[in-house]
């Protein structure tokens, strides 16, 4: 069944305020790979909330078994619950599938938070609200897990959309998207529009909410405003990019740009927060604190541990600064910036004790594995994973949450020299370690 109609978001307009809608730029249109224009059958095929991940409905096996699968651009295994678990309503039953093939191999995947293990096989897979194809894909049947499945999240598996280099147990295990492209005529590109709720969801609203869209094989122009700006994929493992400058309310953090990418910067839909390297996080928090100093918040808030609440509808968005990340552009010495609002980096959460209040968690946190541009960043933008051309595109999302004064933005070009120097070169070890955050 279709996932339901798109609802206007309570604390923001569906697009920029009237009069501010940017004209569609066409200079990049002719260069887009794949089908252009409308992917009606794929729009609104995601559900979920930033705190628990976004999932797409998939079917596995013959006859088809329907499962909800977390969309994760920060890992590369397609894995599904395959045994009873207290948090799972349903799971993949291999013995019921006539097309299941055992690969006779175990697999173990640790994330920053949570881990799982299981048995590898292949089966027929399709996406009901996706392209009209069925592919044979590698599947990890999860038999044991720890802090991986989330109570009430409504997903039963994970779709790792990154590259084979970080697949487990090794890079010989072909990821789902590679199989999809190889076995069909679908172009090697997908795009994500993650629509943050903008307000805490109670049970009734949660059922009606729509999470966003995963467009497989191209770009849907109805999902963004303005133009798409592209940053190169530095290396095909995670979706690694290079940040060349960071500003808080237009104030440069003035750090050596290598610090922003230490030890990497990735775009990861499976992580909730914007995660920053220790030094960068400390500088950013100092700057955000200073900008929002008209109100005092406990230290626990800045550590992501404590909620802050305001009477419903009175959240003082204007006291919080915007955060801008400048990304390496496609042209030498050219960058562009993406700007998010507090509506993205303050994550709405339900506080049972004060359900009449609007409560939020600070969704910027510290990382020891580099910058992770998680859902709080992605919820501001339509993000194009143009694998065919080794680049990631950003445009202002048509569903991002904002107010009448400010909107998320993607702007450029800016002149930035020596951007290559901003990338950190990880010392070569025998094996790279998958440490995707699930913060």
């Amino acid at each position: 069944t279709h996932l339901g109609i798109r609802l206007p978001l309570r604390s923001g307009l569906a697009g920029p305020p009237l009069g501010l809608r940017l004209p569609r730029e066409t200079d990049e249109e002719s260069e887009e790979p794949g089908r252009r224009g409308s992917f009606v059958e794929m729009v609104d095929n995601l559900r979920g909330k930033s705190g628990q991940g976004y999932y797409v409905e998939m079917t596995v096996g013959s006859p088809p078994q329907t499962l909800n699968i977390l969309v994760d651009t920060g890992s590369s295994n397609f894995a599904v619950g395959a045994a009873p678990h207290p948090f799972l309503h349903r799971y993949y039953q291999r013995q019921l599938s006539s097309t299941y093939r055992d690969l006779r191999k175990g697999v173990y995947v640790p994330y920053t938070q949570g881990k799982w293990e299981g048995e590898l096989g292949t089966d027929l897979v399709s996406i009901p609200h996706g392209p009209n194809v069925t592919v044979r894909a590698n599947i990890a049947a999860i038999t044991e897990s720890d802090k991986f499945f989330i109570n009430g999240s409504n997903w039963e598996g994970i779709l790792g959309l990154a590259y084979a280099e970080i697949a487990r147990p090794d890079d010989s295990l072909e990821p789902f998207f590679d199989s999809l492209v190889k076995q069909t005529h679908i172009p090697n590109i997908f795009s994500l529009q993650l629509c943050g709720a903008g307000f805490p969801l109670n049970q009734t609203e949660a059922l009606a909410s729509v999470g966003g869209s995963m467009i497989i094989g191209g770009i849907d122009h109805s999902l963004y405003t303005g133009r798409l700006w592209y940053t190169p994929i530095r290396r095909e493992w995670y979706y690694e990019v290079i940040i060349v400058r960071v500003e808080i309310n237009g104030q440069d953090l003035k750090m050596d740009c290598k610090e922003y990418n230490y030890d990497k910067s990735i775009v990861d839909s499976g992580t909730t927060n914007l995660r920053l390297p220790k030094k960068v996080f400390e500088a950013a928090v100092k700057s955000i604190k200073a900008a929002s100093s008209t109100e005092k918040f406990p230290d626990g808030f800045w550590l992501g541990e404590q909620l802050v609440c305001w009477q419903a509808g009175t959240t003082p968005w204007n006291i919080f600064p915007v955060i801008s990340l400048y990304l390496m552009g496609e042209v030498t010495n050219q960058s562009f910036r993406i700007t998010i609002l507090p509506q993205q980096y303050l994550r709405p959460v339900e506080d049972v004790a004060t359900s009449q209040d609007d409560c939020y968690k600070f969704a910027v946190s510290q990382s020891s594995t580099g910058t992770v541009m998680g859902a709080v960043i992605m919820e501001g933008f339509y993000v194009v994973f143009d694998r065919a051309r080794k680049r990631i595109g950003f445009a202002v999302s048509a569903c991002h949450v904002h107010d009448e004064f400010r909107t998320a933005a993607v702007e450029g070009p800016f002149v930035t020299a020596d951007m290559e120097d901003c990338g950190y070169n990880i010392p070569q070890t025998d094996e790279s370690t998958l440490m995707t955050g699930r913060a």
Partner: antibody
Amino acid sequence: EVQLLESGGGLVQPGGSLRLSCAASGFTFSSRAMGWVRQAPGKGLEWVSATSGSGGSIYYADSVKGRFTISRDNSKNTLYLQMNSLRAEDTAVYYCAKGGSQWLYAPGSWFDPWGQGTLVTVSS
Amino acid sequence: EIVLTQSPATLSLSPGERATLSCRASQSVSSYLAWYQQKPGQAPRLLIYDASNRATGIPARFSGSGSGTDFTLTISSLEPEDFAVYYCVQRSNFPWTFGGGTKVEIK
């Protein structure tokens, strides 16, 4: 000190059944994978079965699949191997072994130490 | 099934000599390979795991190397207590398999 004590071995006729037990102490049993390995007299080693800490992941050798069942009782710190439809080629010393973590398939999670073993003889 | 072939079957050496034991897999096992030592009447004990990591309490004279299909266990200078049978084992694919063993005996 880690201790693994196997019991339940003995002489059984072909087609018969036997249940081996492995009593574990000196570590948190529920947080370790456990396994059974066998060694026929004068021969090499053969993996028989293994289970993750909570029993979710289970491995069986092809030669015993459908005949042997591994299980564990974490409240009793005991690992079991139920052996049915026994054959002459199942004759061996059966060792119980402790995994390096709760995970069965994790790199680094190898099995050590092993118990001293219990002899199973299948003969008419 | 992945077959692990150990060579030589028997290695006759004197204490103080260097022992080099080989384990070859019929297909890649990445680094999911370990080495065990077994003395007569005793249970095996883990020496090396994940191809090159020494297990807890194992002396530095034991070292492992290799990945993919070719693996080596080296004992840099044999001690009297090192004379035993050595097995390699893989956990990359089902079924998990052991090599046939290499017996290191006193010359």
